[in-house]
């Protein structure tokens, strides 16, 4: 005998209390597939979450993050505070990158400037809190009299971070 519940379309549920009649999902709930015995509660976008797509009887609500936050996790399950470029997020809030480090994103952490000398090159453009240094030709490649900017830069060997 075929289960009559399989005839219930998305947006309804098979109501066992009413002889397996297909009943519409109650307000603030949905069923995205047919044949379901219950409807799922709609996701609510509260606090740092904002509604990207309203819930309907056949699909869940979709959230993203309010301005100043970015999404993490599948379907934006988490919101993390943005910082400015040149900063990183700590528990005490956004902090400027230490000298010799940079962050070119509004999220994430600061990382050290490239040490051009490890590749036998010189610094063509100084690093900032927001940008890495730009390495140029090796000092030996420069024509006589030409100068290159070489500020002190922390070593950037794998496994060593600025302290």
């Amino acid at each position: 005998i075929q289960d009559s519940c399989s005839n219930c379309p998305a947006g309804t549920f098979c109501d066992n209390n009413r002889s397996q009649i297909c009943s519409p999902c109650p307000p603030n709930s949905f069923s995205s597939a047919g044949g379901q015995r219950t409807c799922d509660i709609c996701r609510q976008c509260k606090g740092v979450f904002r509604t990207r797509k309203e819930c309907s009887s056949t699909s869940n609500a979709e959230c993203d993050c309010i301005s100043g936050f970015h999404c993490l996790g599948a379907g934006c399950t988490m919101c993390e505070q943005d910082c400015k470029q040149g900063q990183e997020l700590t528990k005490k809030g956004c902090k400027d990158c230490c000298f010799g480090t940079f962050n070119d994103q509004k999220r994430g952490i600061c990382r050290p400037w490239t040490n051009c000398s490890l590749d036998g090159k010189s610094v063509l453009v100084n690093g900032t809190k927001e940008r890495d240094v730009v390495c140029g030709p090796s000092p030996a490649d420069l024509s006589p009299g030409a100068s290159s900017v070489t500020p002190p830069a922390p070593a950037r060997e794998p496994g060593h971070s600025p302290q």
Epitope: L72, G73, A74, T77, M78, E80, T90, K91, Q105, G108, I109, R111, P112, T114, D132, R156, P158, G159, S161, Q163
Partner: antibody, heavy 116, light 109 residues
């Protein structure tokens, strides 16, 4: 959608080398840190190190410094974990995960078995 | 590096409250995160940044963090909550992530 897909299980002998991979898709691979996490049989999670694929900057846990090498090829959205000489004690499940503090996406894990 | 210590196991009756501690020097100065891992699966975030619950994680999960202890609390524990739980923190000294040793939560009955 965001996915991290790891290479398949490996069975190796002590002293052999190995490189396992983690391919990211569905997001800007270059601009998110990738971490590697070890889980030995029946044991807990251990953070090994991380890489920023945009410029391949790496940072290791002191426990794993010099024991493994983490690398990435941003052109193919793939991070790697490699050993030059495996030991029996390297037998474990290895996960890649997106992030440096909050790990919001994880690979399915690569089981590495080292046995003579 | 900071070391995070968790009890190896915690048992709780269904419907009761489970508390899992994670202790480490001044962990309250850093964000603590909590992961749930079920057998054969990758870990999943259940609490991030001390007390925030990802959407899709039941309201019975909550977290706190101050001084030397972070705590994961599961109110009205259900059988499906049986799993291993790990705390973690990112430390700006050494720029490393550290996991606690993990706690096996057993739901009795």
């Amino acid at each position: 959608q965001v996915q991290l897909v790891q290479s398949g299980a490996e069975v190796k002998k002590p002293g052999e080398s190995l490189k396992i991979s983690c391919k990211g898709s569905g997001y800007s691979f270059s601009t998110y840190w990738i971490s590697w996490v070890r889980q030995m049989p029946g044991k807990g999670l251990e953070w090994m190190g991380k890489i920023y694929p945009g410029d391949s900057y790496t940072n290791y846990s002191p426990s794993f410094q010099g024991q493994v090498t983490i690398s990435a090829d941003k052109s193919i959205s793939t991070a790697y974990l490699q050993w030059s000489s495996l030991k029996a004690s390297d037998t474990a499940m290895y996960y890649c995960a997106r992030g440096y503090g909050i790990f919001d996406y994880w690979g399915q894990g690569t089981l590495v078995t080292v046995s003579s | 590096d900071i070391e995070l210590t968790q009890p190896p196991s915690v048992s709780v009756a269904p419907g009761q409250t489970a508390r899992i501690s994670c202790s480490g020097d001044n962990i309250g100065d850093q964000y603590a995160h909590w992961y749930q891992q079920k057998p054969g699966q990758a870990p999943v975030v259940v609490i991030y940044q001390d007390k925030n619950r990802p959407s899709g994680i039941p309201e019975r999960f909550s977290g706190s963090n101050s001084g030397n202890t972070a705590t994961l609390t599961i109110s009205g524990t259900q059988a499906e909550d049986e799993a291993d739980y790990y705390c973690s923190t990112y430390t700006f000294v050494g720029f490393t992530t550290v996991f606690g040793g993990g706690t096996k939560l057993t739901v009795l009955g």
